[in-house]
Structure formats: C-alpha cells, structure tokens
C-alpha cells in the first residue's frame, strides 16, 4: 500500500492529527521535499548576519554577512570580521602583515612573498604588505642571444626580389 | 488538554467586518505561537495570521494584508480575528491553531476546534 503522507508536497506536512492530510507549514516554516511529518523551523538572520532570500514555506532563509564581514562555512553560518589589504585576522583583531608577507584581500592570512631566486629569477618589483613581490627575467634571460622571441622579417614591398 | 473554541463567525456582505474569537484552555495563548487558518469551500487549508515569538512578531498571508488584525488577550486567554472590508474569497471555516515545536526540530499545528464559518455574500 501506498503511504498517504507521500501524496503531500513541499510546502506541507503530513498531518496525523487530521488523517495525514497535507497541511500547510506554518509560518515560519518549510518543507523543501514532499512527504514529510513536519516542516523545519526557517533559519533567522540574526545579528551579524542579514537575509539574503527570504524564507518560504518550501525552501529556507539564506543569509549573507553585514558590511564589515565575510561568510565563512556551508551555508554561511559563521561570519567573519574583514581586514584591510595588507592585515590578518588574529585573536586580538586586525594585525599588519610582518615583513616579508603580504595579504592582497579582505580575508584570509598574510602569506609569503614569492622567493623569485628558488626559480632562479631577480626581483623586479619589491612586495609590500599588500602585494606580493613580482620577479624578473632570469639574468640567463637577459644574455645576448639568449631570446626565444624572433624578431619579424622586415616587411618588402611587393614585386620586388630580394637583392 | 488542549482546546480550542472558535466563535464569531456569520453570514456577511462585501466589505462587512467581523471579529472571530478563539477561547483557549489547557495552554496560555500569551506564551505559545497560535494563529489562525481557513479551509475554503473544496480547498485546502491556508494559513491567515498568527502571533509568532511568544508575541514577538506576526504573520499576515498577502490575501489579508491590511485588512485583518490578529490580537490576544492575555488575560481572558483568547485569540480574535479582526477582519475588515470582507471578500467573497473570505468564505471559509476558520480555526484557531496552535503552532507546535518538536523536539526533533520540526514543526507542525494543532486545531482541535470545530472552526467557525464565515460566509461572504451579498
């Protein structure tokens, strides 16, 4: 035999009280699947958090983090201060990058410049706190007729042989 | 036990008002989340109003918005529905329901009462 409460769509649960007739979810609530015995209670965008789609009786509130802060975990369920360019999150707040480090986001650890001589590359533009360290051309790079680029014929006008 | 008495309802013409009550015992409405649904002639049930986080905030459906009111009084422990420039889409049993928060974290309602009808026509 057929389960009754498989009849009930989202947006309603089964209800034994009434002979397993579909019942609305209350409000508040929502059922995002058909046949279930209850709705589940809509998350709350709370606080820190504020609501990013609002929750209906088949699927659930979602929430995104005020200005300032950033969505960490499934579903967005922790918030995050942000920091500046060129800071970290720490457990006493916003700290500069120590030298030598940089952070070029909101979020996130200071991580270290890239050593442009493990690749055996000069460094062309020094790093800051904000932007890591832009290496050059290998000085083997910049040895005469060391260049892979070959420059283009000069261009001949037509009807003309070459001398 | 739970019970639920609504009263009030009546035949009505457009744009009539009425106000239904909702005489609760065996729990206090001032701190529960109760409200009321309707089943129109062959339709199912839809939730109208209800007063959600213990009085906190309330829920109106987008049909009734701006023209019923959903209140309590805490002492005489009942419900009422104020309901005002009335439409024949009105026409319905109206019940009084307790909303019902399950340990598991699901939710779900009680009516237990009869329901009272209200009927829109001119």
């Known amino acids: 035999l057929q389960d009754p409460c498989s009849n009930c769509p989202a947006g309603t649960f089964c209800d034994n009280n009434r002979n397993q007739i579909c019942s609305p979810c209350p409000p508040n609530s929502f059922s995002s699947a058909g046949g279930q015995r209850t709705c589940d209670i809509c998350r709350q965008c709370k606080g820190v958090f504020r609501t990013r789609k609002e929750c209906s009786s088949t699927s659930n509130a979602e929430c995104d983090c005020t200005p300032g802060f950033h969505c960490l975990g499934a579903g967005c369920s922790m918030c995050e201060q942000d920091c500046k360019q060129g800071q970290e999150l720490t457990k006493k707040g916003c700290k500069d990058c120590c030298f030598g480090t940089f952070n070029d986001q909101k979020r996130g650890i200071c991580r270290p410049w890239t050593n442009c001589s493990l690749d055996g590359k000069s460094v062309l533009v020094n790093g800051t706190k904000e932007r890591d360290v832009v290496c050059g051309p290998s000085p083997a790079d910049l040895s005469p007729g060391a260049s892979s680029v070959t420059p283009p014929a000069p261009a001949r006008e037509p009807g003309h042989s070459p001398q | 036990e739970v019970q639920l008495l609504e009263s009030g309802g009546g035949l009505v013409q457009p744009g009539g008002s009425l106000r239904l009550s909702c005489a609760a015992s065996?729990?206090?409405?001032?701190?529960?989340?109760v409200g009321w649904v309707r089943q129109a002639p062959g339709k199912g049930l839809e939730w109208v109003s209800a007063?959600?986080?213990?009085?906190?905030?309330?829920y109106y459906a987008e049909s009734v918005k701006g023209r019923f009111t959903i209140s309590r009084d805490n002492a005489k422990n009942t419900l009422y529905l104020q309901m005002s420039s009335l439409r024949a889409e009105d026409t319905a049993v109206y019940y009084c329901?307790?909303?019902?928060?399950?340990?598991?974290?699901?939710?779900?309602?009680?009516?237990r009462g009869q329901g009272t009808q209200v009927t829109v026509s001119s």
């Open positions: 329901a307790r909303i019902v928060y399950h340990a598991g974290g699901g939710v779900t309602f009680d009516t």
């Open positions: 065996g729990f206090t409405v001032s701190a529960e989340d």
């Open positions: 007063i959600l986080d213990k009085g906190g905030s309330t």
